[in-house]
Amino acid sequence: GWVWNQFFVPEEMNTTSHHIGQLRSDLDNGNNSFQYKLLGAGAGSTFIIDERTGDIYAIQKLDREERSLYILRAQVIDIATGRAVEPESEFVIKVSDINDNEPKFLDEPYEAIVPEMSPEGTLVIQVTASDADDPSSGNNARLLYSLLQGQPYFSVEPTTGVIRISSKMDRELQDEYWVIIQAKDMIGQPGALSGTTSVLIKLSDVNDNKPIFKESLYRLTVSESAPTGTSIGTIMAYDNDIGENAEMDYSIEEDDSQTFDIITNHETQEGIVILKKKVDFEHQNHYGIRAKVKNHHVPEQLMKYHTEASTTFIKIQVEDVDEP
């Protein structure tokens, strides 16, 4: 019968011929009366056999990631008779792995959006690297993830590639972050190969800023001939938030005379001071009103940022009109 051990050949061997093992018949007494032959894909070009001894050699550099095993057939013939000594047999040569591939992030570019002020531990995104080496061969494809850039705001779970928030961030200070993640094979041991990826993390806005008046004091004038409903001027607050989180409503906080009103222009986010009832220069020619501004939408959990509404004082001077 045939005698052989399992055949392994390391990939990427640079030698011109590399002895893999020996195929022999147990009838072979070593007197060179048998001839061994190799057949199948790779026979003669990748692998050769010593016809006399049955020793098998690899004569080409192999890449396991291209082909990890070869199925060949062996024959042994009695030279004197030309007859087969053993029935033709199929055998396998396995290409064994070396750590010749670095981890690669295949789904890049990565981009994630997370609300500003998210608590520590909030999941942002998971990045995954793949390694073409053999996962069953030692640690060649066992990866560890680490953060090269992004501290102290982000952390990455070493074995899963899950990126989490590690420190609260304020969109109004910085609205996006570039995080660089490294994946290292060999679980980080010597000889490890690595790959990196960049993750763009954008902060979405939450309503953590209240509107604040640009001026603590405004001065407006109104003619005593102005009819009710007249717009006598505008006031404006600013809000560091964006979108609907910056939408605001103006209102009168204090006007003993009940002469004025404020409406909000939702296009411009300005407050328009309106004459609610006619003024009479001879009766009163100086008014002072206090206006306040609040956000339109404030979720309950963000009310702590909106405790005291911003106010401004408006001095209104009535201009005299000569009466006939």
């Epitope: 001026e215 603590s216 004091l217 405004y218 001065r219 004038t221 204090e254 003993d256 005379s257 001879e282 009766h283 009163q284 020619n285 100086h286 008014y287 002072g288 206090r290 004082f313 001095k315």
Partner: antibody
Framework: QVQLQESGPGLVKPSETLSLTCTVS??????????WSWIRQPPGKGLEWIGY???????YYNPSLKSRVTISVDTSKNQFSLKLSSVTAADTAVYYC????????????WGQGTLVTVSS | EIVLTQSPGTLSLSPGERATLSCRAS???????LAWYQQKPGQAPRLLIY???SRATGIPDRFSGSGSGTDFTLTISRLEPEDFTVYYC????????FGPGTKVDIK
């Protein structure tokens, strides 16, 4: 802290024009929303408001003095001025410059006052 | 114009006593448009109260203001020696007018 300082002659002849200047320090006369006033106080008597000016040059005067008063402003010098024409002995007073408040038309900041005597 | 009348013209009290100064307007004014000042001899007036019950910066809490319509009051809860001087009310709704003053002197 806003400070105001009046300056000008202490003696003016009857029928002439009284001229005073108020220099503002510790703040800009162009600050939005503030009015700059002149107020006077005859010796031993009460206070009388003369008029005010806004940094844009818009002025408003006490109706009883309107025909004789001009208040002007020089934002480059951070000053505003009072001119009162055709003075008589009744115009003898301590003249104060003042700035109104951040929550109303009351007078929050005052100069220390300068006595102007009308006499020949 | 709105005429302000202050009473009494002179108020004679002892240190530690409560002083109540009155200011009456010739026509109704909004309470937001009245102020009180203190003036010591040779000095400019100093704002005490505006609106009519807000204390100006640095004014001790023994000073308080109240009132509405035509009647307004300045109260000094416990007179200190430095409080014996002249007090003026001022309205700033229809132009600007001052009352004639109330002198608080030591009895």
């Amino acid at each position: 802290q806003v400070q105001l300082q009046e300056s000008g002659p202490g003696l003016v002849k009857p029928s002439e024009t009284l001229s005073l200047t108020c220099t503002v320090s510790g703040g800009s006369i162009s600050s939005s929303g503030y009015y700059w006033s002149w107020i006077r106080q005859p010796p031993g008597k009460g206070l009388e408001w003369i008029g005010y000016i806004y940094y844009t040059g818009s002025a408003y005067y006490n109706p009883s003095l309107k025909s004789r008063v001009t208040i002007s402003v020089d934002t480059s010098k951070n000053q505003f001025s009072l001119k009162l024409s055709s003075v008589t002995a009744a115009d003898t007073a301590v003249y104060y410059c003042a700035r109104d408040g951040s929550s109303g038309w009351y007078f929050q900041y005052w100069g220390q006052g300068t006595l102007v005597t009308v006499s020949s | 114009e709105i005429v302000l009348t202050q009473s009494p013209g002179t108020l004679s009290l002892s240190p530690g006593e409560r002083a109540t100064l009155s200011c009456r307007a010739s026509q109704s004014i909004s309470s937001s448009y009245l102020a009180w000042y203190q003036q010591k001899p040779g000095q400019a007036p100093r704002l005490l109260i505006y609106g009519p019950s807000s204390r100006a910066t640095g004014i001790p809490d023994r000073f308080s203001g109240s009132g509405s319509g035509t009647d307004f009051t300045l109260t000094i809860s416990r007179l200190e020696p430095e409080d014996f001087t002249v007090y003026y009310c001022q309205q700033y709704g229809s132009s600007f007018t001052f009352g004639p003053g109330t002198k608080v002197d030591i009895k």
